[in-house]
């Protein structure tokens, strides 16, 4: 109970007659009734609804106020809807008035109405019709009013009826103080309320056992003049390894943990982890399972993946394409990537050494997210072993043997590398003479060179080719004053090399008989 009520009067608690003063005697009437739980109670009722100008007063006995300064009056009453009473619409009312009178002693049985101070006019939130009568769900209205600060030793309460049909079921008079409570895992002691209606007393709370103050947010509450704790500021939270149970912090049980005071409650240890004591702030991984440094404590412990499956290869001279299926077991993680280890082997000794850095991997050698790779620039007629390893976030933490899929292959003859150093030797109106250098890596005997050329405007929609065995050639039958694009590639028994970069050459205009060397209009490094 957050608000401690110190009772000064409780009509419901009285079994004998209340014997309050009724004036006139024909007005308010004390009767025995039953409350909503069929418990016998003493009530006062009045239903003088037929005559106008009613003025029926009911006064309590003298009430000593004790230490109170502000007094609360709680009224429980039922009020009958005037519409449910036949023929009384002009005279029936649906409110009554509440008064008080302060004195230092009991002044006797006379009600001196002019001395009483009006507290309020009381209206029902819910009145009831004849159809509701007697059903004990009698639409009991509860109204609370306050008086004070009081200066005398006691007071009377009075109820003025002006022509309503009312039963006063309960009158409770009390004052309040803030009762010791535990709020937000902080203990706040009994606190006397402030004397002023608007005053708030700030109280600092103390964290319960195994709790700590939230960072820079120490628990405080305010005790209002109404005896209510208001405006909780800050809080305590259960330490790591403890969770809130009601107003206490209890240790996490075995197989449970709480890693931070910021977490609300203990969680079951994630898969493949355990805690064998109470109050654990983290769970240890089982043998063979690990947590990556970036893994939060709430994720399962995981292990390295198994080897990739169904590794297949395809050799094209000195290029090998590898493809595989994901591992059967990803170790419980979604961050599986692949890395390729290339070894060049000599079958005679059976020894293998890592491939050099001049090998190309497409798209890359490590951190592969897709399950394929192309290995390029291998030596022709050489033996290679490729190991494909699946890797995840805990692979580097494991001390157990690497798991990989391997394949051994022998490369074929390679096609030649790209022709370089293409030059314009002569440019005429209808012919261009070009020269070039042999590829750096012929990878065999070059049988011929193939020159591809086309008008630049045609954008390779139609092109012509010219074959030659030497490293120079004259291309004839060209149009004057036209820009041509030239590309050259070498040919061996193993196949075609890549085309050289594009070379743009403009033939001479027809009107000019003068011969000169044309300059390149543009050149492009990307091979076609």
């Amino acid at each position: 109970q957050a608000a401690k009520e110190v009772l000064l009067l409780d009509s419901k608690a009285q079994q004998t007659e209340l014997e309050w003063i009724s004036s006139p005697p024909s007005g308010w009437e004390e009767i025995s009734g039953l409350d909503e739980n069929y418990t016998p109670i003493r009530t006062y009722q009045v239903c003088q609804v037929m005559e106008p100008n009613q003025n029926n007063w009911l006064r309590t006995n003298w009430i000593s106020k004790g230490n109170a300064q502000r007094i609360f009056v709680e009224l429980k009453f039922t009020l009958r809807d005037c519409n449910s009473l036949p023929g009384v619409l002009g005279t029936c009312k649906e409110t009554f008035n509440l008064y008080y009178y302060e004195t230092d002693y009991d002044t006797g049985r006379n009600i001196r109405e002019n001395l009483y101070v009006k507290i309020d006019t009381i209206a029902a939130d819910e009145s009831f019709t004849q159809g509701d009568l007697g059903e004990r769900k009698m639409k009991l209205n509860t109204e609370v009013r306050e008086i004070g600060p009081l200066s005398k030793k006691g007071f009377y309460l009075a109820f003025q009826d002006v022509g309503a049909c009312i039963a006063l079921v309960s009158v409770k008079v009390y004052y309040k103080k803030c009762w010791s409570i535990v709020e937000n895992l902080a203990v706040f002691p009994d606190t006397v309320t402030g004397s002023e209606f608007s005053s708030l007393v700030e109280v600092r709370g103390t964290c319960v056992s195994s709790a700590e103050e939230e960072a820079e947010n120490s628990p405080r509450m305010h005790c209002s003049a109404e005896g209510e704790w208001l405006v909780p500021i800050g809080k305590c939270i259960c330490k790591a390894g403890y969770q809130q149970k009601g107003d206490t912090c209890e240790p996490c049980g075995r197989r449970f943990y709480k890693s931070s005071s910021q977490d609300l409650q203990c969680s079951r240890c994630p898969t493949h982890s355990f805690s064998d004591r109470e109050g654990s702030s983290r769970c240890e991984c089982e043998d063979g399972y690990y947590r990556a440094p970036s893994d939060p404590p709430y994720v399962a412990c995981t292990r390295p993946p198994s080897a990739p499956q169904n590794l297949i290869f395809n050799i094209n001279q000195t290029t090998v394409s590898l493809e595989w299926s994901p591992p059967a077991d990803n170790g419980g993680r979604n961050d599986v990537t692949y890395r390729i280890l290339c070894k060049r082997c000599s079958w005679e000794q059976g020894e293998c050494v890592p491939c050099g850095s001049n090998i190309g991997y497409m798209p890359q050698q490590t951190g592969l997210e897709d399950n394929y790779v192309t290995v390029m620039d291998l030596l022709a007629h050489a033996n290679y072993t490729f190991e494909v390893e699946a890797v995840n976030g805990v692979s580097d933490l494991s001390r157990s043997q690497r798991l990989f899929a391997a394949v051994s292959i022998t490369t074929g003859q390679a096609a030649p590398s790209q022709v370089s150093g293409v030059m314009k030797e002569r440019v005429l109106q209808r012919s261009v003479q070009l020269s070039w250098q042999e590829p750096e890596h012929p990878n065999g005997v070059i049988t011929e060179y193939e020159i591809k050329y086309y008008e630049k405007d045609q954008r390779e929609r139609t092109y012509s080719t010219l074959k030659t065995k030497s490293t120079s050639a004259s291309i004839n039958n060209l149009k004057p004053g036209t820009v041509y694009v030239f590309q050259i590639r070498a040919v061996t028994a193993a196949g075609y090399g890549n085309y050289s970069p594009r070379l743009d050459v403009a033939t001479l205009e027809e009107a000019s008989g003068k011969m000169f060397e044309a300059t390149a209009v543009s050149s492009e490094q990307n091979p076609v």
Epitope: S26, G33, L34, Q45, C47, Q48, V49, M50, E51, P52, T78, L79, R80, L85, P86, G87, V88, G90, T91, Q130, G131, D132, L133, G134, E135, M138, C165, I166, A167
Partner: antibody, heavy 121, light 106 residues
Framework: QVQLLQSGAEVKKPGASVKVPCKAS????????MSWVRQAPGQGLEWMGW????????TYAQGFTGRFVFSLDTSVSTAYLQISSLKAEDTAVYYC??????????????WGQGTLVTVSS | EIVLTQSPATLSVSPGERATLSCRAS??????LAWYQQKPGQAPRLLIY???TWATGIPDRFSASGSGTDFTLTISRVEPEDFAVYYC????????FGQGTKVEIK
């Protein structure tokens, strides 16, 4: 002491009229409605209707309209039941009864001693 | 109009025994029901109103309950002065009485 006083027995011929008085004492007459109830010899109770003693407004039950009239004289705190064109079947004890409205329900809490009206030729 | 049917018509009990009287309405009257006692040669007396609330001065051996269409008046231990006719009465827009139950000495 709250009481309702009715007149003594009346013997009337068919077709005649009778006016039964009901004098209230011990409370404010205009603060409570007045009901009329009929009881034929050896029979049960029949509610005839009621009158608002403050406004004089009457309400008649089914079967008691036309020949039956409720009236008041508040100066002498008396309610009246007048029956005209009397018939033999009007022979009965006629009770006036004070109506009590309360929060918890209504009822007729104070009764007159009854007036026996006999209709006979 | 609402018809009230009381049962039994006559109830024979010995003093000190329990008596249970029933009143059934032809349609719901909520809790708008009163009970009256009438002794021979006397005017009726209000016992209960609001289906279950005692009128002033009524002994607590009388109790009543019910709402809607079914109501009961109970005399826990019948005293000699309780032998009489008992009527239920509903008060809606129009008021009606039941035909009565006679409680007689067995």
């Amino acid at each position: 002491q709250v009481q309702l006083l009715q007149s003594g027995a009346e013997v009337k011929k068919p077709g005649a009229s009778v006016k039964v008085p009901c004098k209230a004492s011990g409370y404010t007459f205009t603060s409570r409605a007045m009901s009329w109830v009929r009881q034929a010899p050896g029979q049960g109770l029949e509610w005839m209707g009621w009158i608002n003693t403050n406004t004089g407004n009457p309400t008649y039950a089914q079967g008691f309209t036309g020949r039956f009239v409720f009236s008041l004289d508040t100066s002498v705190s008396t309610a009246y039941l007048q029956i005209s064109s009397l018939k033999a079947e009007d022979t009965a004890v006629y009770y006036c009864a004070r109506v009590r409205f309360t929060v918890y329900g209504d009822g007729m809490d104070v009764w007159g001693q009854g007036t026996l009206v006999t209709v006979s030729s | 109009e609402i018809v009230l049917t009381q049962s039994p018509a006559t109830l024979s009990v010995s003093p000190g025994e329990r008596a249970t009287l029933s009143c059934r309405a032809s349609q719901s009257v909520s809790s708008n029901l009163a009970w009256y006692q009438q002794k021979p040669g006397q005017a009726p007396r209000l016992l209960i109103y609001g289906a279950s609330t005692w009128a002033t001065g009524i002994p607590d051996r009388f109790s009543a309950s019910g709402s809607g269409t079914d109501f009961t008046l109970t005399i826990s231990r019948v005293e000699p002065e309780d032998f009489a006719v008992y009527y239920c009465q509903q008060y809606g827009p129009s008021w009606t009485f039941g035909q009565g139950t006679k409680v007689e000495i067995k």
